[in-house]
Interface confidence: low
């Protein structure tokens, strides 16, 4: 896995480059889990949808994630997370049009109705971690990212390479 | 449709304790802060602390830490807030309210408001 | 921690005025919620995150600022809007204005 300065120094290099407009190499349609295994799941409330992470019970159906992935422009300097050298991101939607988001100012993950060509902070660095597990870094943001805080997503800052593999960062995705 | 259900009003001594309690429905309440607030007559309103139903993380302010407990019961969707060691300053309403969002941290509002319930201390 | 001011405390207006509260936060916040509470009520959502309307609010109601200084606009005051208005904003925890009573003139 790629060390935190290689991380940032990518995702920086992300930001002269527009790949909003790219379409993405593959899509994947997936469960999303903590490393702890409580599922990740989306509902319909207040008007607008809400993130949950939570024990299913065993009858209970996950929710499927499409993640969309797109091969970055920009060669990286080290290997181990990307195709080729070359780094990849997604796109996370749970249902039709609307996408996670990363709210950097309030530390919040979030989902927003939006339209093609998708903005910068609906894009997240993948990382292929230990234990068939993956984490999500923030394009926006680099050293931010995806975790679980008290049982809901938040956008969380990691600050040295050691905390890359720390579980609540970690997610594993699965086809059933 | 969402909605919090305190306890009746209560007089009490000083120094005794008052244990309020917030029920409610219409979501997923292990999912949700629930924050707890209070109103002295004619005053503006003053956050006493908040919890999580999910884990049972809660956060208390500064001036009530030590005389507040806050928690809650997933089994029935009702949260409670233990006031103790009573004075004659603690006479207010206090109010159960949950967040707008059950994830992020700062800037997730307060969306819903209990219908508050009266504590008056009195000898 | 921040703290929020709001003035002024408390204002006269007549039905089909104009008027402005603003809160001003002790350090820079990302966004700033508004809520109205009626004697003997408990407060209700008007605008959260600076200027989005809660459900149900009229469209006379308004928000707008950003860093320090936000303010609650009322473009034409309603019978129904004489109350109490109040701020709030803060990271880790709500943290709250002092309120402006809005009285009838």
């Known amino acids: 896995a790629f060390g935190i300065s290689g991380v940032q120094k990518y995702t920086r290099a992300l930001h002269d480059s527009s790949i909003t407009g790219i379409s993405p190499i593959t899509e994947y349609l997936a469960s999303l889990s903590t490393y702890n295994d409580q599922s990740i799941t989306f509902a319909l409330e207040d008007e607008s949808y809400e993130i949950y992470v939570e024990d299913l019970k065993k009858d209970e159906k996950k929710d499927k994630v499409l993640l969309s992935y797109y091969e970055s422009q920009h060669p990286s300097n080290e290997s181990g997370d990307g195709v080729d050298g070359k780094m990849l991101m997604v796109t996370l939607s749970p249902t039709k049009d609307f996408w996670l988001h990363a709210n950097n100012k309030e530390h919040s993950v979030e989902l927003h109705k939006c339209e093609k060509p998708l903005p910068d902070q609906a894009f997240f660095v993948l990382h292929n971690m230990h234990s068939n597990c993956v984490s999500f870094e923030c394009k926006t943001d680099p050293g931010v990212f995806i975790g679980v805080k008290d049982n809901h997503l938040a956008l969380i800052k990691v600050d040295s390479s050691e905390n890359l593999c720390t579980e609540n960062i970690l997610f594993k995705l699965s086809e059933t | 449709e969402v909605q919090l259900v305190q306890s009746g009003a209560e007089v009490k001594k000083p120094g005794a304790s008052v244990k309020v309690s917030c029920k409610a429905s219409?979501?997923?309440?292990?999912?949700?802060?629930i924050q707890w607030v209070r109103q002295a007559p004619g005053q503006g309103l003053e956050w006493m602390g908040e919890?999580?139903?999910?884990?049972?993380?809660?956060y208390y302010s500064e001036k009530f830490k030590g005389r507040v407990t806050m928690t809650t019961d997933t089994s029935t969707s009702t949260a409670y807030m233990e006031l103790r060691s009573l004075r004659s300053d603690d006479t207010a309403v206090y109010y159960c309210?949950?967040?707008?969002?059950?994830?992020?941290?700062?800037?997730?509002?307060?969306?819903?408001w209990g219908q508050g319930t009266l504590v008056t201390v009195s000898s | 921690d921040i703290q929020l001011t709001q003035s002024p405390s408390s204002v006269s207006a007549s039905v089909g005025d104009r008027v402005t509260i603003t809160c001003s936060a002790t350090?820079?916040?990302?966004?700033m919620h508004w809520h109205q509470q009626k004697p003997g009520k408990a407060p209700k959502l008007l605008i959260y995150r600076t200027s989005n309307l809660a459900s149900g609010v009229p469209s006379r109601f308004s928000g707008s600022g950003s860093g320090t200084d936000y303010t609650l606009t009322i473009s034409s005051l309603q019978p129904e809007d004489f109350a109490t208005y109040y701020c709030s904003g803060g990271y880790s925890h709500p943290t709250f204005g002092g309120g402006t009573k809005v009285e009838i003139k």
């Open positions: 919890i999580f139903p999910g884990t049972g993380t809660s």
């Open positions: 350090s820079s916040v990302s966004s």
């Open positions: 219409g979501f997923r309440f292990k999912n949700y802060w």
């Open positions: 309210a949950r967040k707008h969002r059950g994830y992020g941290y700062g800037g997730a509002w307060i969306a819903y």
